[in-house]
Interface confidence: medium
């Protein structure tokens, strides 16, 4: 589930180059890696550089969101002549270098994936010592995290004129379709709100008017699975309250 594409200028996949005598700086990453929430995924990144036989100090860095300025999620440093890249930063302990930077490989493993990890990641290598040089992937690799639906909130809320409405919010990727069922409803898609800005995996469906007492069930479904949750509406007749 990685989609790689040919970069016609270099005949390499997502290869970014910087001209230089002899060998040149370039980085090879796939445009996208897909994995399911909970799994581990490998973000491949290999590079070439113009500094033949460089064995001085180096630092390998991965950042998220945007190149050059995005927050670092992983960083390690290797001393002169050492093949061991000592981890200095691994966000939440979930990032681990698999590649050997001395062999031009910065490939990273991300474990226990969550929907929040669905971002673009950028690899970077820095040389220090006799040679001072650095290079970073500009396009990066997009980590696409998929997940079966999970209902994160279901509730009944008061609305004007002593009526009640129900809200169901679910997350998943692809964003799940929501349906309500309940007394005198049959199966209803109700009013589904599009994923919210900044919350691309969340979908909310509203039942604007609950006209009958009983059990209301929200079902969320996508290609990876389905989930459901229920609320109960019981109004104290003759009073203006409700038990849910």
């Amino acid at each position: 589930f990685v989609r790689t594409k040919i970069d016609t200028t270099e005949n390499l996949l997502n290869t970014e180059v910087h001209s230089s005598p002899a060998q040149r700086w370039s980085m090879q990453v796939p445009p996208e890696v897909s994995a399911e929430a909970g799994d581990a995924a490998v973000l491949p990144c290999t590079f070439t550089h113009p500094h033949r036989h460089y064995d001085g100090p180096l630092t390998a860095i991965w950042r998220a969101g945007e190149p050059y300025a995005g927050p670092q999620v992983f960083r390690c440093a290797a001393a002169r002549g050492s093949e061991l890249c000592q981890t200095a930063l691994s966000l939440h302990g979930r990032f681990r270098l698999l590649g050997n930077p001395r062999r031009n490989d910065l490939s990273l493993r991300v474990e226990r994936l969550a929907l929040a990890d669905d971002r673009r990641y950028f690899c970077r290598v820095e040389f220090a010592g006799d040679v001072h040089d650095r290079y970073e992937s500009r396009h990066g690799v997009r980590l696409h995290v998929t997940a079966a639906p999970r209902i994160v909130n279901i509730s009944v809320l008061p609305s004007p004129a002593h009526a009640f409405r129900a809200l169901c919010t679910a997350e998943g990727e692809p964003p799940p379709a929501l349906a309500w069922s309940g007394p005198a409803l049959g199966n209803s898609l109700a009013a589904v709100r599009s994923p919210r800005e900044g919350h691309g995996h969340l979908v909310t469906a509203e039942l604007p008017a609950l006209t009958h007492d009983g059990r209301y069930t929200c079902t969320a479904a996508n290609s990876l699975g389905r989930s459901e949750a229920s609320v109960y509406l019981f109004r104290f007749h003759g009073a203006s309250g409700a038990s849910t």
Epitope: F1, L13, L97, R103
Partner: antibody, heavy 123, light 107 residues
Framework: QVQLQESGPGLVKPSETLSLTCTVS????????VHWVRQPPGKGLEWIVL???????TYNSALKSRVTISKDTSKNQVSLKLSSVTAADTAVYYC?????????????????WGQGTLVTVSS | DIQMTQSPSSLSASVGDRVTITCKAS??????LAWYQQKPGKAPKLLIS???SLETGVPSRFSGSGSGTDYTLTISSLQPEDVATYYC?????????FGGGTKVEIK
């Protein structure tokens, strides 16, 4: 020397759960991961899942909804469960060692394989 | 998913012949390619990883080459013990995928 041995029932009924165990020797599951791969009779190889040395998992998404993998490092065993089987799941099932995780450059190759066990799904 | 297409699906050659098997990936795999040998009734055996690196103990008549999407396994001088089915496998992306196999026989 490095060895992997698959075991489990040779016959499973449709809709039931297939359970297989891979017992390893000559290396530690603390340092190496294990893949499961299957091969229907007369056909090619299909990768199922990898459990890394630290217990993390990477699944083939086409099978993930039916697959469970776990390991018991102290017993040198990795187990595979495949639920809701059909005749299409009839195959030789192999476990294979995943080389040491760090710095190997061999993220997903399989350097030693078990001999495989044939599982037939039939009523 | 990255599809791996092997050709030919089968071949027959004489002892001592040079044999070439090709594997084409549907996308670039950056040389993250392995070759396996599977003899009848046996498990696969890793021959080559990284497109070109011969595993320890594998005879030097086996070699791998290629880059980008096109890769080749060559047996420089076919021996009777090389009768087997050969599979390529990419590991640039998950799910890991194998070629359909090439069955090699002796004439």
């Amino acid at each position: 020397q490095v060895q992997l041995q698959e075991s489990g029932p040779g016959l499973v009924k449709p809709s039931e759960t297939l359970s297989l165990t891979c017992t390893v020797s000559g290396f530690s599951l603390s340092n190496y991961g294990v893949h499961w791969v299957r091969q229907p009779p007369g056909k090619g190889l299909e990768w199922i899942v990898l459990i890394w040395s630290d217990g993390s998992t990477t699944y083939n998404s086409a099978l993930k909804s039916r697959v469970t993998i776990s390991k018991d490092t102290s017993k040198n065993q990795v187990s595979l469960k495949l639920s809701s089987v059909t005749a299409a799941d009839t195959a030789v099932y192999y476990c294979a060692r995943h080389p040491y995780d760090d710095y190997s450059g061999y993220y997903y190759t399989m350097d030693y394989w078990g001999q495989g066990t044939l599982v037939t799904v039939s009523s | 998913d990255i599809q791996m297409t092997q050709s030919p699906s089968s071949l027959s050659a004489s002892v001592g012949d040079r044999v070439t098997i090709t594997c084409k990936a549907s996308d670039h795999i950056n040389n993250w390619l392995a070759w396996y040998q599977q003899k009848p009734g046996k498990a696969p055996k890793l021959l080559i990883s990284g497109a070109t690196s011969l595993e320890t103990g594998v005879p030097s008549r086996f070699s791998g080459s290629g880059s980008g999407t096109d890769y080749t396994l060559t047996i420089s001088s076919l021996q009777p013990e090389d009768v087997a089915t050969y599979y390529c496998q990419q590991y640039w992306s998950s799910p890991l995928t194998f070629g359909g196999g090439t069955k090699v026989e002796i004439k």
